[in-house]
């Protein structure tokens, strides 16, 4: 199934010479001209949402965390759950929505890049069982970011955005994650349509830079929902 493909390819298979690993996959997006998305992906439709099994937070979307769906439930059965908004209870940073972190058991505001980088996807594909192994490397090798002391430059392999130098975020590139530039004003961005939608992203783009938000370009308001162009614009 797509879920098993996603889990088996969950950013855990980079060889040591390449360095670190990955950040958080993105959620569903609205299409922009020139960027094509699959139609009929059941994991992208609002009416047909299916829980996404996970083993760790990194396998979930930017606005989700990995946990048992029931309080005190079986730890072996975990799914991606919607992140906790500001002032909600938490046990770890990943439980809080982007822009927040867990302090004294409560989600509080943080500066945007402090804890977890919000990654926006540019291409979402569903794969069925057609997925690749990564040049024979084991899928279960998890690399610790503690091994890497310098901040990653553009194109460096990363685990999360905090592994990347200033102005870069950690975004998916095939079955790895690399540091890519945070978007500047006027650049095309991807607007998340809803939480919890998953596909296997091949190429992802970063979030908009400080003081910018991803909004529909004014002259595209008349376009259909599926082809609205979003760009990074001043608040």
């Amino acid at each position: 199934t797509l879920n098993s493909v996603l889990n088996s390819n969950a950013i855990k298979n980079l060889p040591p010479p390449l360095g670190g690993a990955a950040g958080h996959p993105g959620s569903a997006v609205s299409a922009a001209p020139g960027i094509l998305y699959p139609g009929g992906n059941k994991y992208q439709t609002i009416d047909n949402y299916q829980p996404y099994p996970c083993a760790e937070d990194e396998e979930c979307g930017t606005d989700e965390y990995c946990a048992s769906p029931t309080r005190g439930g079986d730890a072996g059965v975990q799914i991606c759950l919607a992140c906790r908004k500001r002032r909600k209870r938490c046990m770890r940073h990943a439980m809080c929505c982007p822009g927040n972190y867990c302090k004294n058991g409560i989600c509080v505001s943080s500066d945007q890049n402090h804890f977890r980088g919000e990654i926006e996807e540019t291409i979402t594909e569903s794969f069925g069982n057609d997925h690749s192994t990564l040049d024979g490397y084991s899928r279960r090798t998890t690399l610790s970011s503690k091994m890497y002391h310098t901040k990653g430059q553009e194109g460096s392999v990363c685990l999360r955005s905090s592994d990347c130098a200033s102005g870069l975020c950690c975004a998916r590139h095939f079955w790895s994650k690399i540091c890519k530039p945070v978007l500047k004003e006027g650049q095309v961005c991807t607007k998340h349509r809803r939480k919890g939608s998953h596909g296997l992203e091949i190429f992802q783009r970063c979030y908009c830079g400080e003081g910018l938000s991803c909004r529909i370009q004014k002259d595209h308001h008349q376009a259909s929902n599926s082809s609205r162009l979003h760009t990074c614009q001043r608040h």
Epitope: L18, G34, D135, H173, F174, I178, C189, F203
Partner: nanobody
Framework: EVQLVESGGGLVQAGGSLRLSCAAS????????MGWFRQAPGKEREFVAG????????YCADSVKGRFTISRDNAKNTVYLQMNSLKPEDTAVYYC??????????WGQGTQVTVSS
Amino acid sequence: EVQLVESGGGLVQAGGSLRLSCAASGRTFSSYGMGWFRQAPGKEREFVAGISWTLGRTYCADSVKGRFTISRDNAKNTVYLQMNSLKPEDTAVYYCASDGPDAYNSWGQGTQVTVSS
């Protein structure tokens, strides 16, 4: 904006071969890597093969492994998909896509591949 143009598609008999090209042009072409995708009528677009020069590796979907090979020519800013032992189920429109540092992922218009039995 980078332009991607696919070519090399056509009608071929099962067991035959085709070589698709994806040429990049426009302002200075810069990319972390490129991928080939395909979409058959009434089906979702699927990943076929990819090449990452940033990571120095290639990727291939299980369904085409051993039959399709991806390569590139730096001097020509072109990526190729060599397709051997084609099957009727390989019939689809083939697209290439680029993952570039400006974070605007460019797609080509696609090239039709039809494999007759």
